[in-house]
């Protein structure tokens, strides 16, 4: 989970291992800071829970990329 | 291809523990959020619980919470449910199942581990 | 918790006829950002695990014959067996993964009539 020892800087320290569909993804910010150990993405879930994954790894890649297209497809 | 083999019948007294195990080959484990589901003769499905990427630990249904422990052993790709303090209620057939990529549904599960408690 | 109910609990169809199992929601497991209905379906033959059959509440899952079709949203859903086969002769439950505890009906027996 993710950690703001300091806020407003939230870091990751940890990130999961397990796959997640992105069904259960809304939403993800990228943590960048130099405050923080290591670079991350932190998914938020369709019930409002905080993930943090490795940016590197290809699933959250691909998540990254269908919620981006999710988010430029305007709902009719 | 996942596949789950689990522990054998186990025939136990009231107030005993059991512990069933799932053995995971074709994939590695600590990759799988494992979950249990029980079936008492001719009953329903019921989740147990099982670990939950999105809470980022093991999660039990209310129903079971204190009474049962589900554990990891990733050098062995082996997952445990012990449950404690077993009743002639808890007579059922026990599942572990799981899905690759984690949604909340499973598509592959163990062939059932079958644990009756009788005095 | 959400609680599913299945409707009938039992039903007898002749061979070739169409089969339709309901599973209503305590409350929707829609989400309405991406569309998808968090809902499963399951056969079960005696002395098997479940089988997966559907899931978002209309996939076939793959190897599952296109005579089982799901469908429905937000709280009311059906399973249907268009021609119903031997083989189908099992428990079908619906499952709820949208929000824990994932929960499941209680089941609806399919005979032969």
């Known amino acids: 989970q993710p950690d703001a020892i300091n806020a407003p800087v939230t870091c990751c320290y940890n990130f999961t291992n397990r796959k997640i569909s992105v069904q259960r993804l809304a939403s993800y910010r990228r943590i960048t800071s130099s405050k923080c150990p290591k670079e991350a993405v932190i998914f938020k879930t369709i019930v409002a829970k905080e993930i943090c994954a490795d940016p590197k790894q290809k699933w959250v890649q691909d998540s990254m990329d269908h919620l981006d297209k999710q988010t430029q497809t305007p709902k009719t | 291809q996942v596949q789950l083999v689990q522990s054998g019948a186990e025939v136990k007294k009231p107030g005993a523990s059991v512990k069933v195990s799932c053995k995971v080959s074709?994939?590695?484990?600590?990759?799988?959020?494992m979950h249990w589901v029980r079936q008492a003769p001719g009953k329903g499905l019921e989740w147990m619980g099982g670990?939950?990427?999105?809470?980022?630990?093991?999660i039990y249904a209310q129903k079971f919470q204190g009474r049962v422990t589900m554990t990891e052993d990733t050098s062995t790709d082996t997952a445990y449910m012990e449950l404690s303090s077993l009743r002639s209620e808890d007579t059922a057939v026990f599942y572990c199942?799981?899905?690759?990529?984690?949604?909340?549904?499973?598509?592959?599960w163990g062939q059932g581990t079958l644990v009756t408690v009788s005095s | 918790d959400i609680v599913m109910t299945q409707s009938p609990d039992s039903l007898a169809v002749s061979l070739g006829e169409r089969a339709t199992i309901n599973c209503k929601s305590s409350q929707s497991v829609l989400y309405s950002s991406n569309s998808k209905n968090y809902l499963a379906w399951f056969q079960q033959k005696p002395g098997q695990p479940p089988k997966l059959l559907i899931y978002?509440?209309?996939t076939r899952e793959s190897g599952v014959p296109d005579r089982f079709s799901g469908s429905g949203s937000g709280t009311d859903f059906t399973l249907t067996i268009s021609r119903l086969q031997a083989e189908d002769v099992a428990v079908y439950s619906c499952?709820?993964?949208?929000?824990?505890?994932?929960?499941f009906g209680q089941g609806t027996k399919v005979e032969l009539k």
């Open positions: 074709g994939y590695t484990l600590s990759e799988l959020s």
């Open positions: 978002w509440a209309s």
């Open positions: 499952q709820q993964y949208f929000i824990t505890p994932w929960t």
């Open positions: 670990f939950d990427p999105e809470d980022g630990e093991t």
């Open positions: 199942a799981t899905k690759r990529e984690y949604s909340g549904y499973f598509d592959y």
